[in-house]
Amino acid sequence: VPGEAEQPAPELVEVEVGSTALLKCGLSQSQGNLSHVDWFSVHKEKRTLIFRVRQGQGQSEPGEYEQRLSLQDRGATLALTQVTPQDERIFLCQGKRPRSQEYRIQLRVYKAPEEPNIQVNPLGIPVNSKEPEEVATCVGRNGYPIPQVIWYKNGRPLKEEKNRVHIQSSQTVESSGLYTLQSILKAQLVKEDKDAQFYCELNYRLPSGNHMKESREVTVPVFYPTEKVWLEVEPVGMLKEGDRVEIRCLADGNPPPHFSISKQNPSTREAEEETTNDNGVLVLEPARKEHSGRYECQGLDLDTMISLLSEPQELLVNYVSDVRVSPAAPERQEGSSLTLTCEAESSQDLEFQWLREETGQVLERGPVLQLHDLKREAGGGYRCVASVPSIPGLNRTQLVNVAIFGPPWMAFKERKVWVKENMVLNLSCEASGHPRPTISWNVNGTASEQDQDPQRVLSTLNVLVTPELLETGVECTASNDLGKNTSILFLELVNLTTLTPDSNTTTGLSTSTASPHTRANSTSTERKLPEPESRG
């Protein structure tokens, strides 16, 4: 065609896949009458007539474009709907009169790829691989034209590097004409890459300009040999007997080696393997002072059979021995003096305290307690506490009972007990003294005696309330080698008038339980009196 060499560059029309391309015939009125135009598509330099305009009316030609073309803008523009990648070609309009002229339009088609799908090597990468290994893949599906991929490590783009970094990209054409890009990042990794963040970026163009999509960031499992093995003890800080102590082996390799924990035998100085749990942890529970000693860990790489030994670690389980008090069972006369001495061993400095057992009152800070001018009331329990101030909770105690010679001493001299006739009463009487007294009752009934402590005794008596008993009352007598003493229990009949708010309070330690003789015992203390029976 004459003058074809001077053809101007085609007009560029850019459109996204699936949208409508507006192909405006740019012939001027002098070049041709737009009411008489032929439209062609050019593919591989072959022209195909696709649309005719006659007297401003359009008509599609049979073929691939038949259903997708229509006229717009009073016949000057051809609209192509549902654009596909296959539509990327030159379209031309040709005016017929006054002379044959043509106008060329280059249609460019774009489609953003899907979000890149990044996948990491599921088996991981050893640092000593001979060749660069497949680290990760990046797939960008259904883009047009082919997007460009850039790999990043820790936010920096990765460049091809001989024998170190190799990026292998390939693409496949889907039946839709869209491209799927697969990029494989091959690299020789180093130990420091275990924390590296990798991602890929797809760069693509749309009619609106350049765009990019980033994958999620991934880390790669990196395998590297162990260089160092060490022991870790939990809890950290001072350990004491009774604690749960965990000794574990750690290594700086991935995967970690096979661990074993040994303790040095103090007598043979040989290392003896300890039994660990399934996780390779040596659990000492409860920890004892015998667990103290020198521990070390061995890490064995099962691939190379190389064995590494940790620095030995000294473990100290702090303890306090049994506490000894002397004298162990002191007996003294009233008015005399007594010195109590407390001893114990420990892995740390000890602090001693003496406490009164009954009250918890601190009597002395130190291992020696001196008691002068002993009274009967001074008899009873004294506790020595040996503790390690630097280790909270590490202490041992010993109780010593001080006996003061003396006749029985009653918990109460006399008391009133509310009763009902024909009830079984449960009476109690308490006495103390040294030697420990025994208790007897002045009435028949079922009595039982209970030793409360070395100097104290409690006797309980079950007895039926009779008119005679009401008259005589009940006495309990406590006796030992040094004398005797008596407590009196006055029995008072319950009637409605005696049930005043104050009448049911008594003093002392005695409890009385009243129940009808004809019924099974129902136990109640004096503070809650039984309901009086209505006598009809």
Epitope: N117, Q119, L123, K186
Partner: antibody, heavy 116, light 106 residues
Amino acid sequence: QVQLKESGPGLVQSSQTLSLTCTVSGFSLTSNGVSWVRQPPGKGLEWIAAISSGGSTYYNSAFKSRLSISPNTSKSQVLLKMNSLQTEDTGMYFCARHRPFYFDYWGQGVMVTVSS
Amino acid sequence: DIQVTQSPSLLSASVGDRVTLNCKGSQNIYKSLAWFRLKRGEAPKLLIYDANSLQTGIPSRFSGSGSGTDFTLTITSLQPEDVATYFCQQYYSGYTFGAGTKLELK
């Protein structure tokens, strides 16, 4: 086209060593990794070991101490050795090609019976 | 280790049926999941990779979907030759397979 074929003894005595060979064609062992997978009778598939295109070896930790995988690149073969065989090791053994992380082509498998 | 649970273990369907097989990961595996068909005496065949990509040469009646922990293999119109055992496999961390779904004709 891509092909993989497993070969090895059909019957092995317990406590003995099993040697299996995977012969590949249509691709190179320097461009694709290969895995071994087994299927005990009436059970599911279980990954055993792999060798990467770069020559790195990987093992299922359940078998690690008794496995060895190695390539013979010139013969396009991957060899699997499993020692201390037990009757539970009876099953169909497959080799499969990596592309690069999923398995796109498999062999037909070889049946291995471990007799006591 | 990542566990993969397949359901159902047995499925009976008729020719032409739409069939759905499920696979569940014990943790997020993104799209690192493949589906295989296993027939006695044949090499296992890859159907779907990357959760939803159809392997070359596999009929378009097969499709995969899902991401994260829940995945599905769908056969839109069951054919007699589809009778087989189907396995899913995760390749996010190591390689583990589901126990399989045996698909049979009613």
